[in-house]
């Protein structure tokens, strides 16, 4: 009778084991072991027992002890079970961002590991077990579906293998995959709201505001604002689940025409975009041209108004005839025209909006000087010793210099309060002088003496 010890062994891959082959007869003709494994016999006294060191055991094996005794030949097998933890435990790659409400399939691949009967694959969220299955196939694959929720944001998913050799007197060997950190997001189906001027004048600045509600996590949202090829640099303010991005936009003559204003919100692997057209226009103020800005009374003056070729102008409220970008009027300059404003209003239609521009010029009419009865009375009669203010106003442009003299030397204090005396009486020659010439007027002052009763 042949016996083997131990009859069952579990050992690590590549490991060694001592196997003893024994026989019940004292003088066996033959005693040995049959195995493809590298073996080394350890010398022992006696004939009925042999010990072998079997080395580099890579896979399960069943070495067989045999003996040949007088009463016949017999065999005994020992069962070598090799154990080893899996080579690779991996979660199939997934995009790190996942939309809330989507089903996420987690797939764990386990390469190798033995004995498979003792190997279990566990899918985890944090420390919570989602699925536990025996390892079957090569690679062993375990999948589970998770409905992505908001509160999964930042959760770590992993895969763990458990090689449980505790029933064999060994330990529980665990291998864990690299974690997959889930980042969940909500990007609403509604496009962002874009508030901006529909038209924008060259060499001016406009303000663009892009906003969106219902985002999660709002701090991770990227906002891209652009006008044509020009990237805008917005200032973004965040609410609980909303943001508002405000940017200043400057346009130049090169941008003239219809430009696309875009606001794109990128969150996770999704984006929402709003497009708007902005018309960039150039519209200089109309030009008011006077033949000369300063003319003498009686001169013929032409007032012209010229504007953008597509504009329509009115000059002093009178539309151009025919309606268009030019208007003019003719006038003979009178003193009343001095300081008169000529206002040109131009209207341009840009993208359905009416844009108004004005330009005003003032006409200076040179006239005078003038001294008349209304402003410079020819006769004053005042009681002696009364307080009076002689008034004489000369008119003209430029304003004339006025002097009133009696006998060529004695001045009348125009515009000053004086006490009337006999000396004041007499005829004065008032002379108004300017670059336009001079005029004179005689003014008589009568002084009434008091009556003594």
């Amino acid at each position: 009778q042949t016996s083997v010890s131990p009859s069952k062994v579990i050992l690590p891959r590549g490991g060694s084991v001592l196997v003893t082959c024994s026989t019940s007869c004292d003088q066996p003709k033959l005693l040995g072991i049959e195995t493809p494994l590298p073996k080394k016999e350890l010398l022992l006294p006696g004939n009925n027992r042999k010990v072998y060191e079997l080395s580099n055991v890579q896979e399960d094996s069943q070495p067989m002890c045999y003996s040949n005794c007088p009463d016949g030949q017999s065999t005994a097998k020992t069962f070598l079970t090799v154990y080893w933890t899996p080579e690779r435990v991996e979660l199939a790659p997934l995009p790190s961002w996942q939309p809330v409400g989507k089903n996420l399939t987690l797939r764990c691949q386990v390469e190798g590991g033995a004995p498979r009967a003792n190997l279990t694959v566990v899918l985890l969220r944090g420390e919570k077990e989602l699925k536990r299955e025996p390892a079957v196939g090569e690679p062993a694959e375990v999948t589970t579906t998770v409905l992505v929720r908001r509160d999964h944001h930042g959760a770590n998913f992993s895969c763990r293998t458990e090689l449980d050799l505790r029933p064999q007197g060994l330990e529980l060997f665990e291998n864990t995959s690299a974690p997959y950190q889930l980042q969940t997001f909500v990007l609403p189906a509604t496009p962002p709201q874009l508030v901006s001027p529909r038209v924008l004048e060259v060499d001016t600045q406009g303000t663009v505001v892009c906003s969106l509600d219902g985002l999660f996590p709002v701090s991770e949202a990227q906002v891209h604002l652009a006008l044509g090829d020009q990237r805008l640099n917005p200032t973004v303010t965040y609410g609980n689940d909303s943001f508002s991005a405000k940017a200043s936009v400057s346009v130049t003559a090169e941008d003239e025409g219809t430009q696309r204003l875009t606001c794109a919100v990128i969150l996770g692997n999704q984006s929402q975009e709003t497009l708007q057209t902005v018309t960039i226009y150039s519209f200089p103020a109309p030009n008011v041209i006077l033949t000369k800005p300063e003319v003498s009374e009686g001169t013929e003056v032409t007032v012209k108004c010229e504007a953008h070729p597509r504009a329509k102008v009115t000059l002093n409220g009178v539309p151009a005839q025919p309606l268009g970008p030019r208007a003019q009027l003719l006038l003979k300059a009178t003193p009343e025209d001095n300081g008169r404003s000529f206002s040109c209003s131009a209207t341009l239609e840009v993208a359905g909006q009416l844009i108004h521009k004005n330009q005003t010029r003032e006409l200076r009419v040179l006239y005078g000087p003038r001294l008349d009865e209304r402003d410079c009375p020819g006769n004053w009669t005042w009681p002696e010793n009364s307080q009076q203010t002689p008034m004489c106003q000369a008119w003209g442009n430029p304003l004339p210099e006025l002097k009133c003299l009696k006998d060529g030397t004695f001045p009348l204090p125009i515009g000053e309060s004086v006490t009337v005396t006999r000396d004041l009486e007499g005829t004065y020659l008032c002379r108004a002088r300017s670059t336009q010439g001079e005029v004179t007027r005689k003014v008589t002052v009568n002084v009434l003496s008091p009556r003594y009763e």
Epitope: Q58, E87, R88, V89, Q109, E111, G112, R116, V136, G137, E138, P139, E141, A178
Partner: antibody, heavy 120, light 111 residues
């Protein structure tokens, strides 16, 4: 004992397809994946791809995508490699080899190889 | 793809000599789990390749202990302490760290 028995040598004309087989025995067939390797004088050894004998999942070397198709029949413990639109470049010995799916412990047992000659 | 360069291409030996083959990788073969999936095969004339060493230094079942593997990162070596007649053939290194898996060009050990 572990054995991978491959189908015999093939002499085929350019432009056609050929399907070679690899039968596994002496082990639990679905416990190991099967890899296919091409050996030609010009390019030494080239890995074509791997098939899971359990699930039928495959991974190909990009170079052989569209050229090679790997399949498996669990019931007969046989894997197949089909090569399409053959040219003289496909003339080589094609081996199947047993391993873990990602080959982490090496290709421990190989078939005897199938010699493919493409000639008009 | 990862390129494995073997040197020398050919190695004449006397039986009983020590032989050494080098395999250099174009990038590190350390996988993210810390293991290095570099293996060695021997192909004798008219036969299919046979696995000798897996994961740099582990001898496969039935491989004599005169074969040893060493190295790390990008530089690896296979040593045969005393060459025997049955060791003659072409030796290939191979990597299973990066996809697609690749082989070295081979080193022929001859008498």
């Amino acid at each position: 004992q572990v054995q991978l028995q491959q189908s015999g040598a093939e002499l085929v004309r350019p432009g056609v397809s050929v399907k070679i087989s690899c039968k596994g025995s002496g082990y639990t067939f679905t416990d190991y994946a099967l890899h296919w390797v091409k050996q030609s004088h010009a390019k030494s050894l080239e890995w074509i791809g791997v098939i899971s004998t359990y699930s039928g999942n495959t991974d190909y070397n990009q170079k052989f995508r569209g050229k090679a198709t790997m399949t498996v029949d669990k019931s007969s413990t046989t894997a197949y490699l089909e090569l399409a639109r053959l040219t003289s470049e496909d003339s080589a010995i094609h081996y199947c080899a047993r391993s873990l799916y990602f080959g982490s412990s090496g290709f421990d047992y190989w078939g005897q190889g199938t010699a493919l000659t493409v000639s008009s | 793809d990862v390129v494995l360069t073997q040197t020398p291409l050919s190695l004449p030996v006397n039986l009983g000599d020590q032989a050494s083959i080098s395999c250099r990788s174009s990038q590190t073969l350390v996988y993210r789990n810390g293991n290095t999936y570099l293996h060695w095969y021997l192909q004798k004339a008219g036969q299919s390749p046979k696995l000798l060493i897996y994961k740099v230094s582990n001898r496969f079942s039935g491989v004599p202990d005169r074969f040893s593997g060493s190295g790390s990162g990008t530089d690896f070596t296979l040593k045969i302490s005393r060459v025997e007649a049955e060791d003659l053939g072409v030796y290939f290194c191979s990597q299973n760290t990066h996809f697609p898996y690749t082989f070295g060009g081979g080193t022929k050990i001859k008498r």
